[in-house]
């Protein structure tokens, strides 16, 4: 087992008021991914709704770096390379779970947090609102 | 706090041999999401690379329900509704963290797991390999 130093002010697993707390083994199991997955290849360049990847960094969070997609255009790229503004590039979003130390600086106490990330972009037909 | 029944054979937080284990608060904080976000709206129908959402359910996992995208076509849908097979619909994938009960059926003992999910689809220009 691991000898974890008890920091003052850190929650205690025996504390009855510790809210909705569970034990989590941090040895991550890779269910259907390799340890070094190819991340959606180069789709961000080849897509008709291309996107750029921006680094979202927070050392107090795990994972510390999350890559966020930002669509390059309002419209979609046609075969000739021009942008068609009759179509829309939109972000595809996904809720992901992250870990955050809570209270901060406690080595063995965490809180699950849900964040919404943009994973990539897709090209959609716009919703046209007709004015009477 | 929540009274969690102690299943026989379930790890105990005081167990010295409990591997790489930490306390995690499951009162999930939604940093930038609503509690019931509109999942990328109706993009799955309006996209030029439309997809179907398949329910992946596992009561031993948190979250127990994950929606997986499957692209409807090999090609992409044109303005006239026909499929253009000179373009490809491809899934955008994301690695996410989930919690899995370990040992199974234990209410307060989990293991972190990393899974690859398809979030949606995008339309890409194919890579053409020319044979000499």
């Amino acid at each position: 087992g691991i000898a974890i130093p008890r920091n003052s002010g850190c929650p205690n697993s025996e504390d009855k008021n510790f809210p909705r707390t569970v034990m989590v083994n941090l040895n991550i199991h890779n269910r259907n991914t390799s340890t070094n997955p190819k991340r959606s290849s180069d789709y961000y360049n080849r897509s008709t709704s291309p996107w750029n990847l921006h680094r979202n960094e927070d050392p107090e969070r795990y994972p510390s770096v999350i890559w966020e997609a930002k669509c390059r255009h309002l419209g979609c790229v046609k075969a000739d390379g021009n942008v068609d503004y009759h179509m829309n590039s939109v972000p595809i979003q996904q809720e992901i779970l992250v870990l955050r130390r809570e209270p901060r600086h406690c080595p063995n106490s965490f809180r699950l947090e849900k964040i919404l990330v943009s994973v990539g972009c897709t090209c959609v037909t716009p919703i046209v609102h007709h004015v009477a | 706090g929540i009274a969690i029944p102690r299943n026989s054979g379930c790890p105990n937080s005081e167990d010295k041999n409990f591997p790489r284990t930490v306390m995690v608060n499951l009162n999930i904080h939604n940093r930038n999401t609503s509690t019931n976000p509109k999942r990328s709206s109706d993009y799955y129908n309006r996209s030029t690379s439309p997809w179907n959402l398949h329910r992946n359910e596992d009561p031993e996992r948190y979250p127990s329900v994950i929606w997986e995208a499957k692209c409807r076509h090999l090609g992409c849908v044109k303005a006239d509704g026909n499929v253009d097979y000179h373009m490809n619909s491809v899934p955008i994938q994301q690695e996410i963290l989930v919690l899995r009960r370990e040992p199974r059926h234990c209410p307060n003992s989990f293991r972190l797991e990393k899974i690859l999910v398809s979030v949606g689809c995008t339309c890409v220009t194919p890579i053409v390999h020319h044979v000499a």
């Epitope: 941090l26 040895n27 290849s41 990847l53 680094r55 994972p63 080595p107 | 790489r20």
Partner: antibody, heavy 124, light 109 residues
Framework: QVQLQQSGPGLVKPSQTLSLTCAIS??????????WGWIRQSPGRGLEWLGR?????????DYAVSVKSRITINPDTSKNQFSLQLNSVTPEDTAVYYC??????????????WGQGTLVTVSS | DIVLTQSPATLSLSPGERATLSCRAS???????LAWYQQKPGQAPRLLIY???NRATGVPARFSGSGSGTDFTLTISSLEPEDFATYYC??????????FGQGTKVEIK
């Protein structure tokens, strides 16, 4: 399998520029699941990370604060290699320089492939 | 920068004995971003453990890693002659904070 082959001079004069190249085989410098870095090792300093480049729809450069004003790491996609330039060197920059692949899968970070190392001596 | 302090500086043991190497961080680091390397004279470091406890490809089962927060351990259950080398821990806290420990030399007693 992935291999890194380093090349460059072993002797550099003080105040000049140290230049090393790392050729990649078995992977791409533009890979979206790796970063490419330089690390040096000297008796006085131990192992010291200098910086990395990574490609995620554009090139990202990250440099250690200790060398930030003097370092440049550049990719060469046509030759599938990357280079290190360290300006205004002093004898304290004498070290064995390693290039390495940093696995960068969001959930882990570590150096799994290393070059053979190049001893660079800064002396007049 | 986060400072990683390895102890002991030198460990004198005989083949077959158990080696326990310690790495202590000056502040909390994510265990997922903690790695261990082995280095022999004249060679580049070789990855042994990543994510504090995951063995790299081809690394024998006698090597194991553990720890969280600020305290991490590399254990070699039964030393083989080829295990006598210097071992380094390394952490990644952010894109600009990546540091190595000063090393523990495991030598033949």
């Amino acid at each position: 399998q992935v291999q890194l082959q380093q090349s460059g001079p072993g002797l550099v004069k003080p105040s000049q520029t140290l230049s090393l190249t790392c050729a990649i085989s078995g992977d791409s410098v533009s890979s979206s699941s790796a970063a490419w870095g330089w690390i040096r090792q000297s008796p006085g300093r131990g192992l010291e990370w200098l910086g990395r480049i990574s490609y995620r729809s554009k090139w990202y450069n990250d440099y250690a604060v200790s060398v930030k004003s003097r370092i440049t790491i550049n990719p060469d996609t046509s030759k599938n290699q990357f280079s290190l330039q360290l300006n205004s060197v002093t004898p304290e920059d004498t070290a064995v320089y390693y290039c390495a692949r940093e696995v960068d899968s969001m959930y882990y970070s570590y150096f799994d492939i290393w070059g053979q190392g190049t001893l660079v001596t800064v002396s007049s | 920068d986060i400072v990683l302090t390895q102890s002991p500086a030198t460990l004198s043991l005989s083949p077959g004995e158990r080696a326990t190497l310690s790495c202590r961080a000056s502040q909390n680091v994510w265990a997922f971003y903690l790695a261990w390397y082995q280095q022999k004279p004249g060679q580049a470091p070789r990855l042994l453990i990543y994510g504090a406890s995951n063995r790299a490809t081809g690394v024998p089962a006698r090597f194991s890693g553990s720890g969280s927060g600020t305290d991490f351990t590399l254990t070699i259950s039964s030393l083989e002659p080829e295990d006598f080398a210097t071992y380094y821990c390394q952490q990644y806290r952010s894109t600009l904070s990546l540091t190595f420990g000063q090393g523990t030399k495991v030598e033949i007693k």
